[in-house]
């Protein structure tokens, strides 16, 4: 009788994280008796991943019965496939020996190559907001998949970037890979709506990209523009001053009156207006009782956006003589101002 | 035809050492393991020991050790046991048996026993 | 040694009985007991391997279960030729043992 063999015909087996892998097994003889045992790996160092003898195996079932006398057929099943599961797995045929049974006779191997998908792109950007014109950098990061061969992709509002660096790692053989790209994206004053994009295709993905977004609302500092003017008489005495705050991001903003370099009114911007690019807004007015100065009176609108240094605009008031009307006021103007009159 | 045949039985006396042998034949002797099985007038099933036919390597019962031997012929499919210093407690009938186990041990075919009388 | 405890020791049972034999291991064995039929002077019979496989020629009124510790061998109508002694044995290590045997007796 010819001796026995022991056959893996699968050189190599593709199976998606997840799911079962069929790793398998057949003898040519019954004997010499004994059991088989799968390893995962070669050599001394080599993992035991069943034992038809003993042991307790909670993923691994057999594809037959191993306990029928003629059986020769020792393929197996291992469920709940993992990245870490990747390798190659070896069928050995034992023959029975004391104390400890004796290697007889090992199949050629099976190479199990698990599929595993990317995690969703996560892109972060800078921990600081950034003023337009400037270059800041955003980082996409995905994990877990397998195998190496990916693509990422980086757009803004649907433009594509050419402006960024990736890293697949490890470089050399592993189970499992990690994506890292740092793309460098310059500001606009109209980014406020603007979104950074970070695409990562893959094979396990059946053309069905991975997409992770950015707001560049939270990146970006629009500071604002300021300009005070002096409206039309209120009443006899009195003149309204005007400090327009135009298109300004994020709307933490604090705004403050000084008189002649004395603080005279501080308030937060509440009452806002939105524009179209997602900017804001705002108005702030000053009553000034212009009988209770002797001399001019220099009125500076002092604005602090967003925690930065604080950036002013004055307006020399005339006391001389009385001002005349310009213009007229409407209540849009005065929406969100307090009134506060100053003696 | 599968089958163990045995050795004729023995009249040994106390002290005296008996060697019983058991051919095979129908099978692959190599393939499989031997192990031998006595029965005492009356009593249960012992064990006394497995010999691989592939390797030759033995497990011998505790209460035997240093006074069996198995061993194998290879050529003449034949396996034998020896065992020393008898006792008249030794009497019984002694089975070889092939086992047939792929992981675990059991035996399918049997020879029909040799019983080895020890008296004086 | 894993010791192998047969019960009863004897049963008296008539023709078309069920009977049914109990073996327990002192320790966990999996599924690697055998049932064997011994008559008187003859050697012993493999009935049921691995706990619940039948041995190919061995009539389908035999049936073994169990695994770990408990196990049972069943005869589901008994025959006139089942008047034997019945032995379970553990083939999980070394050394093997067996039970001390189950006489069934004609009642």
């Known amino acids: 009788e010819e001796e026995l063999q022991v056959i893996q015909p699968d050189k190599s087996v593709l199976v998606a994280a997840g799911e079962t892998a069929t790793l398998r097994c057949t003898a040519t003889s019954l004997i010499p008796v004994g059991p088989i045992q799968w390893f995962r790996g070669a050599g001394p160092g080599r993992e035991l991943i069943y034992n038809q003898k003993e042991g307790h195996f909670p993923r691994v079932t057999t594809v037959s019965d191993l306990t029928k006398r003629n059986n020769m057929d020792f393929s197996i099943r291992i469920g709940n496939i993992t990245p870490a599961d990747a390798g190659t797995y070896y069928c050995v045929k034992f023959r029975k020996g004391s104390p400890d049974d004796v290697e007889f006779k090992s199949g050629a191997g099976t190479e199990l190559s698990v599929r595993a998908k990317p995690s969703a792109p996560v892109v972060s950007g800078p921990a600081a907001r950034a003023t337009p014109q400037h270059t800041v950098s955003f980082t996409c990061e995905s994990h877990g998949f397998s195998p190496r061969d990916i693509t990422l992709k980086w757009f803004k509002n649907g433009n594509e970037l050419s402006d960024f660096q990736t890293n697949v790692d490890p470089v050399g053989e592993s189970v499992s890979y990690s994506i890292h790209s740092t793309a460098k994206v310059v500001l606009t004053r109209e980014d406020v709506h603007s979104q950074v994009i970070c695409e990562v295709a893959h094979v396990t993905l059946q053309g069905d990209p991975l997409r992770g977004t950015a707001n560049l609302s939270e990146t970006i500092r629009v500071p604002p523009t300021l300009e005070v003017t002096q409206q039309p008489v209120r009443a006899e005495n009195q003149v309204n001053v005007t400090c327009q705050v135009r298109k300004f991001y994020p709307q933490r903003l604090q705004l403050t009156w000084l008189e002649n370099g004395n603080v005279s009114r501080t308030e937060t911007a509440s009452t806002v207006t939105e524009n179209k690019d997602g900017t804001y807004n705002w108005m702030s007015w000053l009553l000034v009782n212009v009988s209770a100065h002797r001399d001019d009176v220099k009125l500076t609108c002092q604005v602090e956006h967003d925690g930065q240094p604080a950036v002013s605009k004055s307006h020399d008031l005339k006391v001389s003589a009385h001002p005349k009307e310009q213009g007229s006021n409407t209540a849009a103007e005065n929406t969100g101002s307090n009134e506060r009159n100053i003696y | 035809q599968v089958q163990l045949v045995q050795s004729g039985a023995e009249v040994k006396k106390p002290g005296a050492s008996v060697k019983v042998s058991c051919k095979a034949s129908g099978y692959t002797f190599g393939g499989y393991g031997i192990s031998w099985v006595r029965q005492a007038p009356g009593q249960g099933l012992e064990w006394m020991g497995w010999?691989?036919?592939?390797?030759?390597?033995?497990n011998y019962a505790q209460k035997l050790q240093g006074r069996v031997t198995m061993t194998t012929d290879t050529s003449t499919s034949t396996a034998y046991m020896e065992l020393r210093s008898l006792r008249s407690d030794d009497t019984a009938v002694y089975y070889c048996?092939?086992?047939?186990?792929?992981?675990?041990?059991?035996?399918?075919?049997w020879g029909r026993g040799t019983l080895v009388t020890v008296s004086s | 040694d894993i010791q192998m405890t047969q019960s009863p020791s004897s049963v008296s049972a008539s023709v078309g009985d069920r009977v049914t034999i109990t073996c327990r291991a002192s320790?966990?064995?999996?599924?690697?007991l055998a049932w064997y039929q011994q008559k008187p002077g003859k050697a012993p019979k493999l009935l049921i391997y691995?706990?619940?496989n039948l041995q190919s020629g061995v009539p389908s009124r035999f049936s073994g279960s169990g695994s770990g510790t408990d196990f049972t061998l069943t005869i589901s109508s008994l025959q006139p030729e089942d008047f034997a002694t019945y032995y379970c044995q553990q083939g999980a290590s070394f050394p093997i043992t067996f039970g001390g045997g189950t006489k069934v007796e004609i009642k």
């Open positions: 691995a706990a619940s």
């Open positions: 048996a092939r086992e047939a186990g792929s992981s675990w041990y059991d035996f399918d075919l």
């Open positions: 320790q966990g064995i999996s599924s690697w």
């Open positions: 010999i691989s036919a592939y390797g030759g390597e033995t």
